[in-house]
Each structure stands twice: as structure tokens, then as C-alpha cells.
């Protein structure tokens, strides 16, 4: 089942989340002059078991002024996150699977790709909430919304964030994020999909987000 | 396969300045937040500044700022992060990484965590002499 609509939008607030539920789906787009390749994916899928999650499928563009003759190859991500770990071992490194299990990361970006991206997005997924640049957070309740399934519709909850402009300093509050729990999410409902840009992606967060250590900077 | 490649560490005096370079191809930064985490030997990463690719905005980490300035070039695909006054704790190697923007193209300073970049760079060492 589809979800009717996008996640609600907050006044001065913007939201992201870092992994997707099994059974998201990645367009594969292709920016201005570009297109995907004849044979190529029309898009990804987090799919996985138990224990590990990945994308299936790669997105591969190729110029639109050729005849397929110049593939661009793009490395599964699962392939991108193996090679970059051989080459810098450090805690920076990003696992090859979400930290959630049942769920993907950020896929990694693709030769020639669309500025932004389109998911198609099932029942359960979150999406977490901040205040954008000059803003402060007044919560009333989680700064989160989720895609559920009730009574075989599908709708979207209301975040429970209220952003205001009286900033006290320059310093970003100390906010935390959100402990994302598998528990308490409608994982047995039937899945539900929703297209959005990536503009508007959903995630899910699994670390305790720590104080905010940078100030800001309007250019 | 797509890469941030970094350059322009290197050792300098105490005082001194240095000019690091995080380049691309095959893919435009209009979408990402791009910037910089250093890790010195034995402790954790830290975010140092990054600039978005939707409206330039820049922000920085309180230990650097006012001393370094994140600047980038959309022709050459290219993020700087010019460092002056190096001090020994500037020290460490740095790793240039992506992240994509939020809802509306938005990006905040508290999503720039080292565990949810989506592409990293090799690094670069910095090495400051006292």
C-alpha cells in the first residue's frame, strides 16, 4: 500500500533520516543530459535477512548524446562500502550494513546522477526532525513522524516539534537525537509506499545524537 | 568507482597555514553536505567544518573556527578547507566526506556525525611541529 502522502512538513524544520526498511525503493534518476542505460535498473531495493541488509541493483547512467557506447559503471554499494574499508581502517568507516537490522543506508552517490532523489517508501519508516539555521526546537513530544497503517489506510503522524526563531545564541542546542527503537513500530502491517525526493527522504537513526559542536556561518 | 580524493596535507610550523583540497568526478555536490572530520592517533573523529551544496552555507566546529574557512569551487567540483594559525592539536589526519541534505535541501550541524557519512576520502595527514 501506498502512504497517501509526504511526511508533514514543519514550519522552519527540516528532516533526514541515515537507513531505510527493507523494501524502500531508489529511483534511478539521471541528471540533465544523461539517462539510464538500456539495460540498466529503474531502481534499487533494500532487500536483506535477518542479519544483513543491502541495496539490490545499481543505477547507471550514460551520457544521452551516445548509443550506449560509454557505460557509466557505478560499484554496487555494498561493493563501494567493501573497498573504502580496505582502504582506511578507522571508526570513521561506515559499516556495510545499517546499523538497524532490516535496514539500509544512505546509498552512496552514482556517476551522473539526479540532484535529488525519489524513494519509494514502506509502513514503519521514520523520519526525525530538527530546526533548520536560526531556529531553536520546542518539543512538545518525539520530533518524528512515521508511515503507519491504520484500518488499511495509511497516513503519516504528526511531529510533535514546534520551531521558533528567538535563537538565545549563535550555538546550535544541544538537541539529542532520537533513540530509534525497532520496538513499538508497526512492522506487522501490510508495507506502504510513498514517493518523495530526496529532499523529503526518510530515515531512521539508531545512535544517540550527541551535543552539537559547530556554530554557524551565513555566507 | 566514484571517490572524494584529498590533498594538501603535509608538515607545517606552528603558526602556519595549510590549503587542503577534497575533489570529485562524475558527480555534482549540489545534493550533499561536504566537508571535513580529522582523526588524530588514538582519539575519536571529530567534525570540523563542512559547506553545503544547495546554498553555500558554511559551519565549523567551535576548536577551529575564526582560524580555518571551507570554501569550494562547483566548476572544479572541489572543497577547500584553507587552515591558518596550526596549532600542535590541529595535528591528525583529514578525512574530506559527503552527506546528503535533509527535507527542502536543509542541512544541519548536529547531522555531521562521522557514523552516517555516505562516501569517504582516503585522508590526508597534517602533521604541525612545535
Known amino acids: 500500500e501506498l502512504c497517501d502522502d509526504d511526511p508533514p512538513e514543519i514550519p522552519h524544520a527540516t528532516f533526514k533520516a541515515m537507513a531505510y526498511k527493507e523494501g524502500t525503493m531508489l529511483n534511478c534518476e539521471c541528471k540533465r543530459g544523461f539517462r539510464r542505460i538500456k539495460s540498466g535498473s529503474l531502481y534499487m531495493l533494500c532487500t536483506g535477512n535477518s542479519s544483513h541488509s543491502s541495496w539490490d541493483n545499481q543505477c547507471q547512467c550514460t551520457s544521452s548524446a551516445t548509443r550506449n557506447t560509454t557505460k557509466q559503471v557505478t560499484p554496487q554499494p555494498e561493493e563501494q562500502k567493501e573497498r573504502k574499508t580496505t582502504e582506511m581502517q578507522s571508526p570513521m568507516q561506515p559499516v556495510d550494513q545499517a546499523s538497524l537490522p532490516g535496514h539500509c543506508r544512505e546509498p552512496p552517490p552514482w556517476e551522473n546522477e539526479a540532484t535529488e532523489r525519489i524513494y519509494h517508501f514502506v509502513v514503519g519508516q521514520m523520519v526525525y526532525y530538527q530546526c533548520v539555521q536560526g531556529y531553536r526546537a520546542l518539543h512538545r513530544g518525539p520530533a518524528e513522524s512515521v508511515c503507519k497503517m491504520t484500518h488499511g489506510k495509511t497516513r503519516w503522524t504528526q511531529p510533535q516539534l514546534i520551531c521558533t526563531g528567538e535563537m538565545e545564541t549563535s550555538q546550535f542546542p544541544g538537541e539529542e537525537k532520537p533513540q530509534a527503537s525497532p520496538e513499538g513500530r508497526p512492522e506487522s502491517e501490510t508495507s506502504c509506499l510513498v514517493t518523495t525526493t530526496d529532499f523529503q527522504i526518510q530515515t531512521e537513526m539508531a545512535a544517540t545524537m550527541e551535543t552539537s559542536i559547530f556554530t554557524t556561518e551565513y555566507q | 568507482q566514484l571517490q572524494l580524493v584529498e590533498s594538501g596535507g603535509g608538515l607545517v610550523q606552528t603558526g602556519g597555514s595549510l590549503r587542503l583540497s577534497c575533489s570529485t568526478s562524475?558527480?555534482?555536490?549540489?545534493?550533499?553536505?561536504i566537508g571535513w572530520f580529522r582523526q588524530a592517533p588514538g582519539k575519536e573523529p571529530e567534525g570540523v567544518s563542512y559547506?553545503?551544496?544547495?546554498?553555500?552555507?558554511?559551519y565549523y566546529a567551535d576548536s577551529v573556527k575564526g582560524r580555518f574557512t571551507i570554501s569550494s569551487d562547483n566548476a572544479k567540483n572541489t572543497v577547500y578547507l584553507h587552515m591558518n594559525s596550526l596549532k600542535p592539536d590541529d595535528a591528525a589526519v583529514y578525512y574530506c566526506?559527503?552527506?546528503?541534505?535533509?527535507?527542502?535541501?536543509?542541512?544541519?550541524?548536529?547531522?555531521?556525525?562521522?557514523?552516517?557519512?555516505?562516501?569517504w576520502g582516503k585522508g590526508t595527514l597534517v602533521t604541525v611541529s612545535s
Open positions: 559547506i553545503t551544496g544547495s546554498d553555500g552555507s558554511t
Open positions: 566526506a559527503i552527506d546528503r541534505l535533509g527535507s527542502g535541501g536543509a542541512y544541519v550541524p548536529i547531522w555531521w556525525r562521522s557514523s552516517d557519512m555516505d562516501l
Open positions: 562524475g558527480f555534482t555536490f549540489d545534493g550533499y553536505a
